[in-house]
């Protein structure tokens, strides 16, 4: 056959989908891959083609649309089972053509069981919800395409393995769940099970997403700097180890950027010549506030070093801030036989 | 399309009860929440509670708690508000309707008018 | 006396424009989504506007919608006689139960 242009697997779109549910993959060469959509193409008099590697196997198969109920069918550029088996597994191929234009990508899908309370393999997506701010809704995700907008679904949400169904501060509102206000205690997969009729069949579809209860907006602060501090001075004699920890605290921000960094003299320590070392620490609260330390740190200290101005900077979306270090040489303390002997005038 | 048939005027006497029925039709009973809402002539809306008819969890108005009692029949598509103890100034239109908590109530009865007289 | 407030009354003639404001507070209104409800004359209510700003289909754009910080604004242009009618808002609170608040309801005259 002629050259095709065969854009590989895309290994970027992980599909999974759970066994005996419907699925609608739609082809990636439109989403990803090409400049023009299918009904574009479709009107050039291209064709597009469906086939697909088992799991396990090197053989390319033609996809069985003849499969009784139409279990597999194609509707545009999209590939439908209804519902999806286990042994659906492989890697799917969509080719689009004519006799002088080819274009190809294959993709993984990977069909996966649950048990009873919604556990599997699948990958979950995280939905960050601000504690105690308000109304915040989540959505069933991905059911747009499944049924037309005269089909009126049931839905049912559970968190965990249980029915949401009381008037708490979770409430299941059709493909909304509404968090009347978050708490900790509402983290945790919530799932919604959305089951519609077609052709005198009931479908289900399961959506589950993990929800994490975060900082509020409300709350956030600038970073605010822990150590150092004008209460500890770093008091060290020439060829000591000086040891300062920068500790910052940063509100939580969505998609804020949080950065800690030393200056030695207004320098970056690059860009000095002494031999420092700057190791980071990081840890986060349950609402994922942020501490980052920063511990700068010279092996031997020398009495230049304990001159320069050692400052701890941070900075977030809420704004930036400065402190500097405490550091002293410190005054050797008097030998007795000499300073001490002359003090009191001994001979 | 979306009904809602309230049951018919009631006259009681102060101390009795009253159990006002609505008739839900034109959509997917269980999938919808029932709110319960009442109007003294003259005066405006005031919430009394709300019923989930898929599991049949309540929750009611603080001044109405202890009094008031909604429940529903899914064999039926039909819910219930009961109301005891009665006092002249529980005399009011009652609304069944139809909705969800964040995101307003959509449909409403037609009302049924409660006179409580001795 | 209702947790939201609202003018007891508002006029206007055909064709203006007219406001209603709803008061209330960072526990209902301002940390919460408002409805806005239309009843005429010996009717039940009918709902004009929910999520603060969302009109339900069949609900011509003349009525509109805002919310800001603790209070929450119906608008409606192009005044008609049909207009005539109480309107209320609503929210609810949650603090540790549920509540369900409406507002006391302005009558609105076109004059």
């Known amino acids: 056959s002629e050259r095709c242009d065969d854009w590989g697997l895309d290994t970027m779109r992980q599909i999974q989908v759970f066994e005996d549910e419907p699925a609608r993959i739609k082809c990636p060469l439109f989403e990803h891959f090409l400049k023009f959509n299918y009904s574009t193409a479709h009107s050039a008099g291209l064709t597009l083609i469906w086939y697909w590697t088992r799991q396990d196997r090197d053989l390319e198969e033609p996809i069985n649309f003849r499969l009784p109920e139409n279990r597999i069918s194609k509707e545009k550029d999209v590939l439908w089972f209804r519902p999806t088996l286990l042994n659906d597994t492989g890697n799917y191929t969509c080719m689009l053509r004519n006799t002088t234009y080819c274009s190809k990508v294959a993709f993984p899908l990977e069909v996966v069981q649950k048990d009873s309370c919604f556990n599997s393999p699948m990958k979950l997506p995280v939905h960050k919800l601000y504690i105690e701010y308000g109304i915040q809704r989540i959505t069933c995700p991905n059911v747009d395409g499944y049924f037309p907008s005269s089909v009126k679904p049931t839905i049912t949400w559970y968190m965990g393995c249980y029915k949401i169904q009381n008037f708490n501060n979770v409430i299941p509102e059709g493909m909304n769940l509404s968090f009347l206000i978050a708490f900790i205690s509402n983290n945790g997969n919530y799932t919604c099970v959305v089951t519609y009729p077609e052709n005198g069949r009931t479908f289900h579809l399961t959506r589950t997403l993990t929800v994490k209860v975060v900082g509020s907006p409300k709350n956030a602060v600038p970073p605010v700097i822990h150590s150092p501090n004008d209460h500890v001075v770093y008091e060290k004699e020439p060829g000591e180890e000086l040891l300062i920890p920068c500790t910052v605290y940063f509100s939580f921000l969505m998609d804020s950027r949080n950065e800690v960094w030393w200056t030695i003299d207004g320098k970056k320590p690059d860009d000095i010549p002494i031999d420092v070392t700057i190791n980071e620490s990081i840890s986060h609260s349950r609402t994922e506030d942020e501490t980052r330390t920063q511990i700068l740190s010279i092996k031997k200290v020398t009495s230049e070093d304990l001159k320069r101005s050692y400052v701890c900077h941070a900075r977030s979306a809420k704004g930036e801030v400065a402190k500097a270090a405490t550091v002293k040489q410190k005054v050797p303390a008097p030998r007795y036989t000499v300073e001490l002997a002359c003090g009191f005038g001994a001979t | 399309q979306v009904q809602l048939v309230q049951s018919g005027a009631e006259v009681k006497k102060p101390g009795a009860s009253v159990k006002v029925s609505c008739k839900a039709s034109g959509y997917t009973f269980t999938s919808y929440y029932m709110h319960w809402v009442r109007q003294a002539p003259g005066q405006g809306l005031e919430w009394m509670g709300i019923i989930n008819p898929s599991g049949g969890s309540t929750s009611y108005a603080q001044k109405f708690q202890g009094r008031v009692t909604m429940t529903r029949d899914t064999s039926t598509s039909t819910v219930y508000m009961e109301l005891s103890s009665l006092r002249s100034e529980d005399t009011a239109v009652y609304y069944c309707?139809?909705?969800?908590?964040?995101?307003?109530?959509?449909?409403w009865g037609q009302g049924t008018l409660v006179t409580v007289s001795s | 006396q209702s947790v939201l407030t609202q003018p007891p009354s508002v006029s206007a003639a055909p064709g203006q424009k007219v406001t209603i404001s709803c008061s209330g507070s960072s526990s209902n209104i301002g940390n919460n989504y408002v409805s806005w409800y239309q009843q005429l004359p010996g009717t039940a209510p009918k709902l004009l506007i929910y999520d603060n700003n969302k009109r339900p289909s069949g609900i011509p754009d003349r009525f509109s919608g805002s919310k800001s910080g603790t209070s929450a604004t119906l608008g409606i242009t192009g005044l008609q006689t049909e207009d005539e009618a109480d309107y209320y808002c609503q929210t609810w609170t949650y603090t540790g139960r549920l509540w369900i608040v409406f507002g006391g309801g302005t009558k609105l005259t076109v004059l």
């Open positions: 309707a139809r909705g969800f908590v964040t995101s307003g109530i959509d449909y």
